[in-house]
Interface confidence: low
């Protein structure tokens, strides 16, 4: 598989540390929507890692939009994530385990798992691919680890793990990783996959900057963003080779990079774009 060959172009095995966002929508771009009102709102900017002001048109847009700076910080900054982590480590179910399954409003139905408070079990449901709530897990195991009781009636012991608030998965606690990588590829390689708003279902690939691999997704046929390639090879060519490992203050090791596009510098120890 050509993707696996590509995996060895980065000189060490160090994975890009995750960019931990409270909710996946914190990674959405500010969207003023099609209407023409002028409303001051706030959004979380993944590049500056701060909540910032923008002008909202009054309709549509996306969930990365908040009435106040405080609400934005509460939803999208790490402090709030740590509060959830504490409750998990205290062996209590996080509040979101008690939310009902929510498919969201999009149409790209994906198999996900949620904790059903009636049956006290994690169950499968179909997620639309956007919005929804945090009672939404990519695997049954993640759901069970976070929301189900253990055999003794207590929460499964997640000591030494941290709730990754982007996808509700468990990741090792000690993940303060130095900034080993710079990104010199196109900035759109860091954006999440975007189905777009039409109704076709085309096979495309996007670069998942979390895991450093090109992954298939279903494209609706219109809209979306530039992280959208017709083949895995094209995706890898455009995005994979943009990562450069920094080994010392001044020195850069190239990893078979073919493009020198715009220079987008990201400190990877704190931010992370969710595979959506």
């Amino acid at each position: 598989d050509s993707e696996e060959d590509e995996e060895h172009t980065i000189i060490t095995d160090t994975e890009l540390p995750p960019l931990k966002l409270m909710h996946s929508f914190c990674a959405f771009k500010a969207d003023d929507g099609p209407c023409k009102a002028i409303m001051k709102r706030f959004f979380f900017n993944i590049f500056t890692r701060q909540c910032e002001e923008f002008i909202y048109g009054g309709c549509e847009g996306n969930q990365n939009r908040f009435e106040s700076l405080e609400e934005c910080k509460k939803m999208c900054t790490r402090d709030n994530a740590n509060r959830i982590i504490k409750t998990t480590l205290q062996q209590e179910k996080p509040d979101f385990c008690f939310l009902e399954e929510d498919p969201g409003i999009c149409r790209g139905y994906i198999t996900r798992y949620f904790y059903n408070n009636q049956t006290k079990q994690c169950e499968r449901f179909k997620y639309g691919g956007c919005l929804g709530n945090m009672n939404n897990f990519e695997t049954l195991e993640e759901c069970k680890n976070i929301c189900e009781d253990g055999p003794n009636g207590f929460q499964v012991d997640n000591y030494g793990t941290q709730l990754n608030a982007v996808n509700n998965s468990l990741t090792p606690q000690s993940t303060k990783v130095p900034s080993l990588f710079e990104f010199h590829g196109p900035s759109w390689c860091l954006t999440p996959a975007d189905r777009g708003l039409c109704r076709a279902n085309e096979n495309r690939f996007y670069y998942n900057s979390v895991i450093g691999k090109c992954r298939p997704f279903k494209y609706s046929g219109c809209g979306g963003n530039e992280n959208n390639f017709t083949s895995k090879q094209e995706c890898l060519r455009a995005c994979k080779k943009g990562f450069i490992q920094r080994i010392s203050k001044g020195g850069l090791i190239k990893t078979k990079r073919k493009r020198k596009k715009q220079r987008v510098k990201i400190a990877y120890e704190e931010i992370f774009v969710k595979n959506m």
Partner: antibody, heavy 117, light 106 residues
Framework: EVQLQQSGPELVKPGASMKISCKAS????????MNWVRQSHGKNLEWIGL????????TFNQKFKGKATLTVDKSSSTAYMELLSLTSEDSAVYYC??????????WGQGTTLTVSS | QIVLTQSPTIMSASPGERVTMTCSAS?????MHWYQQKPGSSPRLLIY???ILSSGVPVRFSGSGSGTSYSLTIRRMEAEDAATYYC?????????FGAGTKLELK
């Protein structure tokens, strides 16, 4: 237990319209899209389209645009398909089927439609 | 749209025999799904995502394949397996089914 209960067989005249119902139970109705599939001559299966009961969005096979209208009543967990301007070509068994954008996992028992003068 | 061609159209097998049927896609697809339909009944999901058995499906059934070529195998044919089997994709719009393979008991 997931169940999809469809309305009974129909005999209609060419040019008429008719509506098939599909009552869902045993799962969260708004959590899954409802697909509709046609089976002609007891053989070929053709996907007509789907409706997302959560927000009423529909997606159709181009072939059936203008032929079928999909609606839901969330309060009764019922999906409906109305077939318009019927001809003998539309005689078939019509299924509602719970599903996803990739496959369907539970099927109704089917509604037989006969279009004849 | 993607056309799915199933072969053979009709086949027969004796109890205990190994059965394999194929589904060929006109373009590459990510996953193939399989349904079983018996006369007078609705289709039933048998295998989804190429190889995952649906709930309650006996382990003698298996699915495999990738790209444009997929197959369904019954390790040891049983009388109750006599049915028509359909493959289905929705990697590309619209969702399409194969024309079916009718499996008869010899």
């Amino acid at each position: 237990e997931v169940q999809l209960q469809q309305s009974g067989p129909e005999l209609v005249k060419p040019g008429a319209s008719m509506k098939i119902s599909c009552k869902a139970s045993g799962y969260s109705f708004t959590g899954y899209p409802m697909n509709w599939v046609r089976q002609s001559h007891g053989k070929n299966l053709e996907w007509i389209g789907l409706i997302n009961p959560y927000n009423g969005d529909t997606t159709f096979n181009q072939k059936f645009k203008g032929k079928a209208t999909l609606t839901v009543d969330k309060s009764s967990s019922t999906a409906y398909m109305e077939l318009l301007s019927l001809t003998s070509e539309d005689s078939a068994v019509y299924y509602c089927a719970r599903g996803t954008y990739e496959y369907v996992d539970y099927w109704g028992q089917g509604t037989t439609l006969t279009v004849s003068s | 749209q993607i056309v799915l061609t199933q072969s053979p159209t009709i086949m027969s097998a004796s109890p205990g025999e190994r059965v394999t049927m194929t589904c060929s896609a006109s373009s590459s697809v990510f996953y193939m799904h399989w349904y079983q339909q018996k006369p007078g009944s609705s289709p039933r999901l048998l295998i989804y995502d190429t190889s995952i058995l649906s709930s309650g499906v006996p382990v003698r059934f298996s699915g495999s394949g990738s790209g444009t070529s997929y197959s369904l195998t019954i390790r040891r044919m049983e009388a109750e397996d006599a049915a028509t089997y359909y493959c289905q994709q929705w990697s590309s719009y619209p969702l399409t089914f194969g024309a079916g393979t009718k499996l008869e008991l010899k």
